[in-house]
Structure formats: C-alpha cells, structure tokens
Amino acid sequence: AGVFELQIHSFGPGPGPGAPRSPCSARLPCRLFFRVCLKPGLSEEAAESPCALGAALSARGPVYTEQPGAPAPDLPLPDGLLQVPFRDAWPGTFSFIIETWREELGDQIGGPAWSLLARVAGRRRLAAGGPWARDIQRAGAWELRFSYRARCEPPAVGTACTRLCRPRSAPSRCGPGLRPCAPLEDECEAPLVCRAGCSPEHGFCEQPGECRCLEGWTGPLCTVPVSTSSCLSPRGPSSATTGCLVPGPGPCDGNPCANGGSCSETPRSFECTCPRGFYGLRCEVSGVTCADGPCFNGGLCVGGADPDSAYICHCPPGFQGSNCEKRVDRCSLQPCRNGGLCLDLGHALRCRCRAGFAGPRCEHDLDDCAGRACANGGTCVEGGGAHRCSCALGFGGRDCRERADPCAARPCAHGGRCYAHFSGLVCACAPGYMGARCEFPVHPDGASALPAAPPGLRPGDPQRYL
C-alpha cells in the first residue's frame, strides 16, 4: 500500500505565439481545480476507462479575476498535493490523465458552472520511494508544470511497496535471516512469504510461495530483464543474478531537454519530446521553418513560412511526435480484440483473427454479429442468437446511431448538477455532499444532509430520494 502524490507547480500560457485568452473575466470570476486519474501499465486506454489505480480531485484554487488588457498570467492554484492512495503493489509503470477544470462564479442560476479547460495524458515509469519527478505537459496553448512521486505507507517498503517492515522484537538485532528495513533502521523486514529467491526489487507476491514480476522483468524469480540488452537501466552495470544495479542519477535528472522539452527515460538513455519550433536530441535546434524540412518519416509540413511562426507536422500512419520522429508501436496498444494477433506492417496494421471472429480489429463475432455493424465506435456483442451493440460513451440505440445524453439518467444524487463532456460526465455537488455522483452526505445528521430521514427511521432502513 502507498500513496501517489501530485504537486501542480503552474498552469498558464505555454511558450510561443497564440497565447490563450484568460479563462476568467471581471464579469465572470473563476477558480481552478484539478483532477488526476491513474491507470496501471503503459497501455493507452480510452479516456473513459476506469481509473484502476485511483483518482483524486484537488481543492478549489483562489478566485481569479482578469485584469483588462493584461496577458493571461499563470493562474492561481489550489493549495496542497493531490493524493491517490493505492492498496496493492505499485506497478512501476503507469498512465496518467490530469484535467484542469474551471469553476465560474458569476451569477449562474443554480450555482457555479464547470468546464474543462485542458487535459494532458502520459505514460511513465516510476519506482516507489524515489525522489520527485518533474514534468511539463502542453494542451493546446496551455502549459502545465507538475511533479509527482509514489511513496509506500508503513509497513510496506521497496520500489513496489511489496516488502513489509515490522517493529523489532528485540532491541539489538533482527531475527535470523531478516535484514533491517532501510531507511527505518529500527524496524526489521517481515519474514518473506514469496517463493524462495524471488527478487526483492523486481518481484512481489500476493500469496505465499508465488513470485510475480514487475513490468520489465521476467523469469521464475524475476531476475531476468525483458530487454535483450544486458541492462534495462542506463544507470549502472549489468549483474548476472539481479539484472541491473541502479546506483547514481537517472538520465532525466536535471532535465537535459532544452526549450521546455519534456524528458522520458528509455531502456538505453533518454528521449526528449520537444515543443513546436524545436527539435534535435535535446530540443536545442530552434528557429525552424518548413524550408528546413523538420518533418521526418514522410511527414507533411504546414505553415511556418518565417522563423516567428510555428510549423506543424502532419505525420503518416505509424509515426508521431512534433516532428514525426517517433515510430508508434501500435501493437503495444493491443488493438486486436478477441485474442487476435497484431501485425504492424509499417504502412498498415493488420489483425489476424481467431476462428469465429472477423473485422479490421477482430471486433465482430461471426455467429451473431455477421453483417451487422455498430456505429460511432460501438462494439457488437453476441447473445442468444441476436446481435446487440455495446455503445461508446455518448451514444445509444440499437446500432449506436442515436446521440445519448449522459446526464439524461439524472446520475448526480442529492441535487447535484450534471455536466457532460467528452470523457463522460461530472457532477457538481450541492454543499454538504461529496463523491463522483454526490452520493455521500458529509454530515448525514446535520442540516446540510437534505432531505432529512423521516421520523422514526432506524439504521438499516432505507431512505428514498426522488
């Protein structure tokens, strides 16, 4: 068990031309708040898939009113960290979504209005117990600067929070075969229940006798790096028994990427994701126009006739990045459904389907779904000889052709107001209520918990709200 912590440093206009308009005005003062959603692994999941590692909402920031004629500055932020507790092992690799929300405080009928200002997402490797990692992400003309870390909650320790520490039974030393728990030298490692020899750094167990590997490691004792190179990490020499030692600083420490580039570690070194107008290994090359041919791998360059205006690379299938410099490992996103085998042919993606399934992504069950298609990203589900569409968020009807209002079912309880946006819905709770759907009265016996229970209601009896 442990806690993922996110510290927002600044949210404001990014570098370059086209500064965004201030989200607040004298007529409509507003304040910001943030939502973070965490998912395990490196899969690029849909925005509406559950935040399996957890989610958190920040407090509201200070009220901000734009000064007329002034450029949009960095906006005032909420105090404190966003904390996402996790109950099981820290996965080591994770995906995140950070949303910046605006709460307008004008004279709206029915209370404040919410709107999504910016949304950034990424995938990272992170060991629990390590230092704060710094990051910069851009969404349109906005820039978000933040730091994050994962830390274990006692008695858990280790890079995955899977080793346990217990107070010493004897004051002088730990029991036979048990080591002191750094940095808690006054505590001892709990007796190991994993399979004998299971790597304490790269393996963990949830049942006695098993040895499950963290991402990037394999073998019965999780001592073999998945990478064919001798060492997964660029930080230290290879070791025959443990895979890699991890002393010294990481390649992204001190952020080697210039001009606002963001750094991510790779198995051998580091990689910079550069803002528009910059490229090179460390984003050090600037003043680029389309005449310089900045788009790689057949990317089409648009705009940027003079050094002051940004260019945009339109990448061909299979490539991404501001300069089309990154090859997309499209099979890592597991696009083939129903156990289909993914083949990345470079120019195209192919799915080799298992018997009984068909379609570009093996999404059609030939039994019930033959010849039937679900519109708007819906998937066909077989059932009792009749086809049924499981529709993507925001669509409904037999073939997912009808636009559905996610707020139509009145999902927000206790008088909460529902707001629809592209990644689902958000409930703005009435004062005194909390939760994704305002399900939780903060003080159910107090005046704010309306409606009150009828007289004589005992614990265990239902209270009905229409």
Epitope: C51, G54, A413, G435, A436, R437, F440, Q463, R464, Y465
Partner: nanobody, 119 residues
Amino acid sequence: EVQLVESGGGLVQPGGSLTLSCVASGSPSSINAYGWYRRAPGKQRELVAGISSDGSKVYSDSVKGRFTISRDNAKNSVYLQMNSLRAEDTAVYYCYYFRTVSGSSMSYWGQGTLVTVSS
C-alpha cells in the same frame, strides 16, 4: 431489501491497524456507492471515506493517507483499512450503501461497529 452487516471493530493501541468489513445482502444494484461514516462521542456522524461504482474514492482530510477504502463487487462487500490509528479515531463506524434504481435513489445504513483506540 438491503441489509448491511459490519465487522472488524475492536480495541487497538495508538499506531495500530484494523480492517473493517461490510457485507450488503438483499438485492444490491450495479449503480451504487459504499461509504464509511463514524460518530465519535458527543459529535455528529461524519463521512470517513466513500467509493463510487466507477471506483473513484473520497476521503475526509483527517484520514487521508492513513485509511484506504476498497470494494469487492463479487462479494457485495466494502472494506476500510485503517493504519496509524489515533485516539481521535475512536468512534462507532457505520457502513453506508447508496443505490439508484430507475431514477430513484435510496440509502441504507448498518448498525455500526465500535472502534476504540487506547493504550
């Protein structure tokens, strides 16, 4: 309809840990939320932690980082893992269940389980 049964309360020393469990029997629905509330002597009942049907969680400021709420949909159960307990955590802890069926919402409460933190 829906009955809630809590367990796991008891006497524990400061700094210790306890896990509370709550099982919902009857006819729980898939669109639901579970929560844990507590009432300390002489105070009104307050929210401790809650978990929605989409898995999102809320915690009161006083327990953040110490308590963890989780649920097991297959067992219609919710759990509250309480670590680093303090004397001020002493209270009767109530399980809360909230569900929506056909646009109508209902909430249910358990009978409560006593947690005493004392040396």
